[in-house]
């Protein structure tokens, strides 16, 4: 039975040209996290494997940095980065937990961060 929940940075806004940290946190479970995948829509951005460490997809190497923690930092943001981001926690013995973040990249100089929220 999957008892865990993923808390994410929620719905966030950032300025074009800036950077943003995407973060998820798995709680309420004692399951072991074996790997965390970060995806943008259907593209794999990065993998953090418990044994092998980080792997950043080659096409994102220039703009994606690992961390902090199991999070991911996106740099040199463009309007095309607007969209969904997923953190996919592979755990044992629970299975897979998925968190979702929606990022809006703004042309203007005003960008406010949304509130944190829970995803069961």
């Amino acid at each position: 039975m999957m008892t865990g929940t993923i808390e994410t940075t929620g719905n966030i806004s950032a300025e074009k040209g800036g950077s943003i940290i995407l973060q998820c946190h798995l709680s309420s479970t004692t399951a072991q996290v074996t790997q965390v995948n970060w995806e943008q829509q259907d593209q794999l951005l990065a993998i953090c494997n418990a044994d092998l460490g980080w792997h950043i997809s080659p096409s994102f190497k220039d703009r994606v940095a690992p961390g902090p923690g199991l999070g991911l930092t996106l740099q040199s943001l463009t309007v095309n980065d607007t969209g969904e981001y997923f953190c996919i926690y592979h755990t044992y013995p629970d299975g897979t937990y998925t968190g979702r973040i929606f990022l809006e990249v703004l042309e203007s100089s005003v960008a406010e961060h949304g509130a944190r929220f829970q995803i069961p």
């Epitope: 719905n11 829509q41 259907d42 607007t82 969209g83 969904e84 997923f86 998925t98 979702r100 929606f102 809006e104 949304g114």
Partner: nanobody
């Protein structure tokens, strides 16, 4: 409980167009992120397009980009999918889905709360 009813499916020749509609019950349609999904015979359900509650953000699967357009009319509680340049591989049952609330679009089926019964689109010469 939200009720979703799709319409507009049918048989169409390759290269032609079709417009699907999805009528939703309830008074909070303007707060529902919505999406279109499809399932071809013997295949898994896949996302086609999705749209935010206010219509500002939309998503398209790579296979339909440039051919399909998702839109909504919040005054009519209706979601649309305009399908142009249809291909044989677009043949499937098309489903609309909605969430109670949320920001942006939702491209994955797991996030949706309510589903319609589907409408069949057959592209054949």
């Amino acid at each position: 409980q939200v009720q979703l009813v799709e319409s507009g499916g049918g048989v169409v020749q390759p290269g032609r167009s079709l417009r699907l509609s999805c009528a939703a019950s309830g008074n909070s349609f303007s707060s529902y992120p919505m999406g279109w999904f499809r399932q071809a015979p013997g295949k898994e359900r896949e996302s086609v397009a999705a749209i935010s509650s206010d219509g500002r953000f939309s998503y398209y699967a790579d296979s339909v980009k440039g051919r399909f357009t998702i839109s909504r009319d919040n005054s009519k509680n209706t979601l649309y999918l305009q399908m142009n340049s249809l291909r044989a591989e677009d043949t499937a049952v098309y489903y609309c889905a909605c969430r109670d609330s949320g920001s942006g679009y939702y491209s994955r089926a797991q996030w949706y709360d309510y589903w319609g019964q589907g409408t069949l689109v057959t592209v054949s010469s």
